[in-house]
């Protein structure tokens, strides 16, 4: 699905007008607070589907989710869906009106929740009170959702300022049914360390007071004991945390680590593992295959990929000739290693608008103290075929030749076709094809020149033609692998006075 | 925000044909929408056609095969091409224009499709 524009946040004008368009190659529908607002269905030659929605006399009213989604999701492969944020400041509205509903909170289990108070403009502070409270409660604030948090049972209002006057919401009330089972969390520092460096792993659990802890883990079976140690978050009500840490972790320290917490008053129990790897040393690796020899075309975008695992952080470097690369001022290249888990990295060079001058051995580096890795590859810059030139000479010895000189990379292939009834050809008849048969009537000299500088192959290609008894049409077209150009030229006998 | 001027409208009989212009008093390169859309007597005002940035022309099913959107960047105008006109093809047409989140209405121009 593309959207336009894109958002995924807006911020539009009071009484205006805003268009948005949704488009997918199946047919696609807006969606407003789960219903379809009035909209146009639109088609494009290429099959593609649209649909348009615009929005007049914008009021703040109109401040909130919008969602782009296929109109019959089934069949599909996935049930995509395009979410764009409009906010329209609008000083005569202040908190947009909740349903009866959002208005009580009901948890069943300690949890975070939303107070879902929401105003028009994003540029609002906006603060949480309890109702009978003057005092701003510290709780983080999303323009789009509201408050989230972890809530006592009390009453709650949203204030803010829109110009000098003070604009209170509905109340909301939280309501705490009953405390639900244990609900245990086991994260660790690292998931892979080195021989020698340390293993910490918490294990959290929420919404009781008095919970035993009980740990599992390599070392353990061995019978060399780790004594937890257990505290509470004071921050957080109700949040006991036991710590289990191993100093100097040896490589038997590998292996499954499981917490399990009961509590006795409920006999509820939970339990969570998670998996510790502990290496010799640090490693880089390289995933998946990079070809030796990349394309891109000229004055196109080009991003290359390189994705490796590595602990710990590497250092990444990219070269080309041997020259180290950086983020350029001009944004003609760009350079990112993101990392897309605790040991995957995914870097990557962008190219804009390729020029030939790119075209080079580049090389990327990750190294940190253990371990390096490097990954070349030869960047090759497609030209598409140009024809520069095709002319037609007679020369004494009788016979006609055409000179046709045209420029791409990679080599383009030459291919000449002649059309003898004007009339009828080629929209009729099939033009034949020359220089590839038997015949003695036409000889054909071709050439080819790389020209360094310029990083293209030239080709120069001469067909002779024997005995030209009427008007011929002669084709010169060239190919590559990036696109195709054609001239033609009309051929007359030495005896016509005249040339078309 | 561009100032939007349309131009072409007329009386046309049915089955004739009429082009209508829409000239920016400014440049209209970076424009991510561009759009008519007309409003029959008594009836809301509705998309016929519209190109977005990078996009084909996309057209409703009424005016598919009749109607053709195009621009000129050069001359900051956008187009449209209305061939084999109904009588229902009869309204006022707007051009609309939208760049980030700042849009633009044309002032309209009277289309009769009538014998």
């Known amino acids: 699905l593309v959207v336009t524009p894109p958002g995924p946040e807006l911020v539009l004008n009071v009484s205006s007008t805003f268009v948005l368009t949704c488009s997918g190659s199946a047919p696609v529908v807006w969606e407003r607070m789960s219903q379809e607002p009035p909209q146009e269905m639109a088609k494009a030659q290429d099959g593609t589907f649209s649909s348009v929605l615009t929005l007049t006399n914008l009021t703040g009213l109109d401040t909130g989710e919008y969602f782009c989604t296929h109109n019959d999701s089934r069949g599909l492969e996935t049930d995509e869906r395009k979410r764009l944020y409009i906010f329209v400041p609008d000083p005569t509205v202040g908190f947009l009106p909740n349903d009866a509903e959002e208005l009580f909170i009901f948890l069943t289990e300690i949890t975070e929740i939303t107070i879902p108070c929401r105003v028009t403009d994003p540029q609002l502070v906006v603060t949480l009170h309890e109702k009978k409270g003057d005092v701003a409660l510290p709780v983080p604030y999303d323009h789009q959702r509201g408050f989230s948090g972890i809530f006592e049972d009390r009453s709650y209002i949203c204030k803010t300022t829109i110009g000098d006057r003070e604009v209170d919401s509905d109340a909301y009330y939280v309501y705490r049914l009953q405390v639900s089972s244990i609900n245990v969390s086991v994260n660790a520092v690292q998931t892979v360390v080195r021989q020698g460096e340390n293993i910490t792993l918490m294990c959290i659990v929420i919404g009781n007071e008095v919970v035993n802890f009980e740990w599992t883990y390599p070392r353990k079976e061995s019978g060399r004991l780790v004594e937890p140690v257990t505290d509470f978050l004071l921050d957080m009500p109700y949040h006991i945390r036991s710590i289990l840490h191993i100093p100097s972790a040896e490589l038997e320290d590998s292996g499954t680590y499981t917490c399990n917490v009961t509590e006795s008053v409920n006999d509820h129990q939970d339990e969570k593992a998670i998996n510790i790897t502990v290496v010799e040393s640090g490693y880089v690796r390289l995933l998946g295959e990079v070809g030796t020899l990349q394309f891109a075309e000229l004055h196109r975008s080009r991003t290359l990929q390189v994705v490796f695992e590595a602990y710990p952080p590497p250092t990444v470097l990219w070269f080309k000739d041997n020259r180290t690369l950086g983020d350029s001022s001009a944004g003609e290249i760009a350079l990112s290693t993101r990392n897309v888990s605790e040991t995957r990295y995914v870097s990557e060079l962008t190219l804009v608008r390729v020029k030939v001058a790119e075209a080079g051995h580049y090389t990327m580096r990750a190294f940190h103290e253990d371990a390096e890795v490097q990954l070349s590859f030869q960047l090759q810059i497609n030209v598409p075929v140009r024809v520069l030139e095709l002319s037609e000479s007679h020369p004494d010895s009788g016979e006609q030749t055409v000179r046709c000189r045209g420029r791409g990379m990679p080599q383009p292939n030459i291919i000449w076709s002649a059309c003898r009834d004007l009339k009828r050809c080629p929209r009729e008849l099939p033009p034949t094809l020359l220089g590839n048969s038997s015949e003695e009537e036409s000889q054909l000299e071709t050439n080819v020149t790389y020209w360094e500088e310029e990083q293209e192959f030239e080709v120069v290609s001469t067909l002779r033609l024997q005995h030209v008894d009427r008007p011929l049409s002669v084709r010169c077209t060239l190919r590559n692998a990036v696109g195709q150009d054609t001239q033609e030229v009309i051929v007359v006998p030495h005896s016509l006075p005249f040339k078309v | 925000e561009v100032q939007l001027v349309e131009s072409g409208g007329a009386l046309v009989q049915p089955g004739g044909s009429l082009r209508l212009s829409c000239a920016a008093s400014g440049s209209i390169v970076s424009i991510d929408f561009m759009g008519w859309y007309r409003q029959a007597p008594g009836k809301q005002r509705e998309v016929v056609t519209f190109i977005t940035s990078g996009g084909s022309p996309n057209y409703v099913d009424s005016v598919e095969g009749r109607f053709t959107i195009s621009r000129d960047n050069a001359k900051n105008t956008m187009y449209l091409q209305m061939n084999s006109l109904k009588p229902e093809d009869t309204a006022v047409y707007y051009c609309?224009?939208?760049?980030?989140?700042?849009?633009?209405w044309g002032q309209g121009t009277q289309v009769t499709v009538s014998s």
């Open positions: 609309y224009m939208q760049s980030g989140t700042a849009g633009s």
